[in-house]
Structures are given as C-alpha cells and as structure tokens.
C-alpha cells in the first residue's frame, strides 16, 4: 500500500505565439481545480476508461478575475498535494491524466458551471520511494508544470511497496526465512499477508493483498466451489471425469465486488458498480472522505469530513453515479424537435436548429413575417418555418424587390401578344378573341361571350390587365 502524490506548480500560457485568452473575466470570475486519474501499466485506453489505480480531486483554487487587456498569467492554484492512495502493489509503470477544470462563479442558474480547460496525459516509469519527478506537459496553448512521486505507507517498503517490514523481535537476527529490510536494517521482512478473508485452505498468495485459488475453487476469497454437477451455461473446458462442461471461472463468478458492489462482465474483464462510500476496482476501498477526492469528472464532494460520515457527490451536467463516474447520454432522449440535432457539450446540452426553428429544443416555429416587410405592396405568407412574399403584380423575388417580367408566363391566350406596362401587362388579342387575357372568343354575330365590352374598347383592341 502507498500513496501517489502530485504537486501542481503552475498552469498558464505556454511559450511561443498565440497566448490563450484568460479563462476568467470580470463578468465571469472563476477558479481552477485539478483532477488526476491513474491507470496501471503503459495503458493507452481512452480517457473515459476507469482510473484503476485511483483518482483524486484537488481543492478549488483562489477566485481569479482577469485584468482587462492583460495577457493570461499563470493562474492561481489550489493549495496542497493531490494524493491518490493505492492499496496493492505500486505497478512501476503507470499512465496519468491530469485535467484542469474551470469553475465559473457568475450568475449561473442552478449553481456553478464546470468546464474542462485542458487535459494532459502521459505514461511514465516510477519506482516507489524515489525522489520527486518533475514534468512539463502542454495542452494546446496551455502549459502545466508539476512534480510527482510514489511513496509506500508503513509497513510496506521497496520499489513496489510489496515488502513488509516489522521491528525485530530479537536484537540479533530476523526470523527463519526472513531477511533484514534494507535500508532499515533494524527491521525485518514480515511474512506475506494475503487479502483479508482469503480462504487458508483453498487460497494462497504470492503478492501481499492477493488471493489466488487452488483448483476447484473460485471467488474473490476462494470460498466458492466450482460446480461439476450442472452442465448448464457451460463456460470452460470439458471435464474428463464427468464428461460434461465444467464452468471455468467467469469474471463475475463469486462476485469479486466487495462491500455490496454489483458485478457486470466486460469484454476483457469485469466492472464493479460500488455503493456510496466505497470505490476501487473491487469496491474494496472504504472509509472514503471528501479529502480522498472520490467524485470524478468535476463532481463536487459534500459532507464526509470523517470516515464515519457519508459523502455525497454533486455531479456536473452530463455525469451521474454515486461518484459521478458515469457519462449520461443525454442526447439519446431525443430532446431536439423539428429535425434539430443534439450536441452534448459536456457542461451543457445544445440543440442546433434547422432554418425556421428556434428555442432551446427547436420547439418554436419562427414567425418569419414579424419585422420582415415585403416590398412594393407584397404580403408576407408563413409556412413550414419559412417566410415567403406573395408579390404584387409586376414584382418578384424573395422580398418583392425585383421587377418581374409580367409577360414571362405567356399570359395572353389564343395567340395574343403581351406587352409589359408600368402597372402590369397588356394583351393584344388575335382577331376573334377578347378579354383581359384574350380568353373569350368573339361570336361570329359580333356578340362576345362577355355581356358587353367596356365603353371605349372594341373587340380586338388591346386589353389592359390591371
């Protein structure tokens, strides 16, 4: 067992051109905090994969307000170290993710807003018990300077914190088979301690805190016999003695999740969903307080000042779970209407609306005629979120600003000829036809289909269409 310690020295603009804008402003003061996530080995998993070695959240830094016109300086940092306790051996190689979060303190509806400012990641080799290692990482235009170390918690010692030391019982030498503990020559290696509760008959360990099962036994403490009587849901190889398939231990057999955690199988292993107050790969870490930084993804920890009182994580938008460890697919609820597309921006949900629609969920069909005049006597017609002008005669285009060619549609019937006129069009009708559009034949007896021609117009005269 031991503790990984991280000290943030500075966070600010990196060298070179393109200094980033200050994340805080006079209108929106803010403060920074950091989250560290550790994974064993030289992991290249996505940032969302579990922090199997542990995670920690810093305190909030001092409130910062940008000085107008000034470049972004190194920003004020939270006090103290980030500490990630590890219960088992220190792996020697590890991956880290350090996130810089901004908490905006403006007039936010529903409390402060969190947003991820920068994320740096890396893979390192580190022996426990060594000196502080210094590092500089850049994320875009930001630069983070930090140092880190891993140290063992007594009685563990060594580069992996796997050797246990106890004061000598006799002044002269250590017990049978046990060596002195270098560099603490006055202490002796202690015998291996298996995981608490590991069956002494059916389990053994080669590393402290481990519980490996003898053949025929399974479960986290090797207390569950492997069944040979049932051939249902076969999993393992065929048994020569019974002739049926003996279930090999599935990742969730015997429930490896401690403290009431529930186990679910994953493609490569298993995942424990822990009850509040417990975390770790197998929900084995208990007595958690807010000082342990149990809330992931920028969750705010409340209560839990001592190990006996529970803490509560207030999760930022987009995360849920007792430790804010689960990302919510908020867009899967289809909140956007009228063909709007849903964007989950982490700190907020946004609907990108199609033309003609507006509102937080694209629920408003825009009144496109409001404040939008149609020129030259046209009238506005709404429909489907789009605005359209019904133009007066002689005009066209989206806003009736274009002078239309009234003859373009060939409005004069029966071979009549069309003439554009300032107030519309005029049809010169072919012999035998009359009317505004030459639509009426003149009867052979001289009478027309119309009751009478208007005074002053003879059949065949050009008809002006008003």
């Amino acid at each position: 067992a031991g503790v990984f310690e991280l000290q943030i020295h500075s966070f600010g603009p990196g060298p070179g051109p393109g200094a980033p804008r200050s994340p805080c402003s006079a209108r929106l003061p803010c403060r920074l905090f950091f989250r560290v996530c550790l994974k064993p080995g030289l992991s290249e998993e996505a940032a969302e994969s579990p922090c199997a070695l542990g995670a920690a959240l810093s305190a909030r830094g001092p409130v910062y307000t940008e000085q107008p016109g000034a470049p972004a300086p190194d920003l004020p940092l939270p006090d103290g170290l980030l500490q990630v306790p590890f219960r088992d051996a220190w792996p020697g190689t590890f991956s880290f993710i350090i996130e810089t979060w901004r908490e905006e303190l403006g007039d936010q509806i529903g409390g402060p807003a969190w947003s991820l400012l920068a994320r740096v990641a890396g893979r390192r080799r580190l022996a426990a018990g060594g000196p502080w290692a210094r590092d500089i990482q850049r994320a875009g235009a930001w630069e983070l300077r930090f140092s880190y170390r891993a140290r063992c918690e007594p009685p563990a010692v060594g580069t992996a914190c796997t050797r246990l030391c106890r004061p000598r019982s006799a002044p002269s030498r250590c017990g049978p088979g046990l060596r002195p503990c270098a560099p603490l020559e006055d202490e002796c290696e202690a015998p291996l301690v298996c995981r608490a509760g590991c069956s002494p008959e059916h389990g053994f360990c080669e590393q402290p805190g481990e519980c490996r099962c003898l053949e025929g036994w399974t479960g986290p403490l090797c207390t569950v016999p492997v069944s040979t009587s049932s051939c249902l849901s076969p999993r393992g190889p065929s048994s020569a003695t019974t002739g049926c398939l003996v279930p090999g231990p599935g990742p969730c057999d015997g429930n490896p999740c401690a403290n009431g955690g529930s186990c679910s199988e994953t493609p490569r292993s298993f995942e424990c969903t822990c009850p509040r107050g417990f975390y770790g790969l197998r929900c084995e870490v208990s007595g958690v307080t807010c000082a342990d930084g149990p809330c992931f993804n920028g969750g705010l920890c409340v209560g839990g000042a001592d190990p006996d009182s529970a803490y509560i994580c207030h999760c930022p938008p987009g995360f849920q779970g007792s430790n804010c460890e689960k990302r919510v697919d908020r867009c899967s609820l289809q909140p956007c209407r009228n063909g709007g597309l849903c964007l989950d921006l982490g700190h907020a949900l946004r609907c990108r609306c199609r033309a003609g629609f507006a509102g937080p969920r694209c629920e408003h069909d825009l009144d496109d005629c409001a404040g939008r005049a149609c020129a030259n006597g046209g009238t506005c017609v709404e429909g489907g979120g789009a605005h359209r002008c019904s133009c007066a005669l002689g005009f066209g285009g989206r806003d009736c600003r274009e002078r239309a060619d009234p003859c373009a549609a060939r409005p004069c019937a029966h071979g009549g000829r069309c003439y554009a006129h300032f107030s519309g069009l005029v049809c010169a009708c072919a012999p035998g036809y009359m009317g505004a559009r030459c639509e009426f034949p003149v009867h052979p007896d001289g009478a027309s289909a119309l009751p009478a021609a208007p005074p002053g117009l003879r059949p065949g005269d050009p008809q002006r269409y008003l």
Epitope: L116, D329, R330, G339, L343, L349, R352
Partner: antibody
Framework: QVQLQQSGPGLVKPSQTLSLTCAIS??????????WNWIRQSPSTGLEWLAR?????????DYEVSVKSQITINPDTSKNQFSLQLNSVTPEDTAVYYC??????????????WGQGTMVTVSS | QSVLTQPPSASGTPGQGVTISCSGS????????VNWYQQLPGTAPKLLIY???QRPSGVPDRFSDSKSGTSASLAISGLQSEDEADYYC???????????FGTGTKVTVL
Amino acid sequence: QVQLQQSGPGLVKPSQTLSLTCAISGDSVSSNSATWNWIRQSPSTGLEWLARTYYRSKWYNDYEVSVKSQITINPDTSKNQFSLQLNSVTPEDTAVYYCARGGIVGAPDAFDIWGQGTMVTVSS
Amino acid sequence: QSVLTQPPSASGTPGQGVTISCSGSSSNIGSNPVNWYQQLPGTAPKLLIYSNNQRPSGVPDRFSDSKSGTSASLAISGLQSEDEADYYCSAWDDWLNGYVFGTGTKVTVL
C-alpha cells in the same frame, strides 16, 4: 461492428449524372441518433462535405450550398442504404467520394465510421 | 476552398511533441465543437478527437486538443513513426449551414 460499403462507377462523362450508393451494416439508416453523409476529397479542394440525410421522426436532408442545385441524397430504408446523385458533372467533380456516419450520441458532427472511398474520374 | 486554415506541414523526432493549429471564425470553431481526423496514405480519414478533447476508444491519450476563441490545436506528445499522416480539423459552420474542414497538415516523423 458498423461498416459502410460504397458502390458506383469510377468513370463518368462530363454533363452526365454520378450515382453512388453506401450500404450500411451494423446500424440502421433510420437510426434516431445518426446522420449519414457524403464527403469528397480532391488535391485541389481538400476534404469537402457535400450532403447528409437523417431521420428524426421524419427525414431531413442538407446540402453544401455550392452544390445544392446539382445534388440529391436519398435514404433507402428497404435496403438499409443511402445514395448520392450529382447531376451535370464536370472535370472539377473528379475526387475520391466517401460516405460517412455521424454516429456518436451528442456529437453529430463527428464522423466516426467511413466507407472505403470511391475514386470518381470525370472525363470524356 | 477550405474554410479552416492549418499549416501545411509539421515534423518532429520520435518521442518529441508536435502541435498543429487550426484557425477558423466565430461561425465555426467559435461556436461549435471541433473534431480532428487522421488520414494515413491511401485510406479514409479516421476520427481522432471529437467535441473538444473526447477520444474514441482505441485512440491513445498522446493525442489531445484544445480550443481558444476561433482557433483550435491538436497536440501529439511522444511522437511515434505510426503518427506520420495527414491531420484535418473540422467543425460545423452556422453561417454556411454545413461542415467545414481544415486545409490539412502533413506530420512527418524524422
């Protein structure tokens, strides 16, 4: 896993119509969370988004403004595929054409699955 | 043709870091998430980072991005030979009502 398989001719004559099809496996063209896109790439213009179709209670289509009058995108639910038609092609339409899915919930702008690409040459 | 501007090339030796910039405007990068794609020679682009520093599974955390105002940048730390490829930024543009891509940056591992 989700795969997109493109089909269509590699050579089209100028002024003719280019037709490409993208067959979807492992997802549905009528998915309520995906968008289905056509993108092309040429040395002269780089990557260029052309069109998309998607279903949210009904079908919606969007087109890149400069090719809007020339292009049609159509989903085919019976065959679980979508197609692109580009009318009156010119040598400038010579490019590698890709279909792609915008399939990450909450990130419709991110094209997470791409077809293999079809090299289309417009030449007489 | 491309609305987003990237440097044509960037290079570094193995283990070094390299940063690619992507400059846009208020209607694209300024108001929408940025996505980054990696394109190896002769293959289709592959989504590398989406919605401002989210990575699809399988993408190493050596790749990270950041955004400030109307510019974004992609940082590759611990450069490896397999990182040699073309990199494109992309975002939705509210003004054009369509997706826009960057001009592309060729990363060479020396």
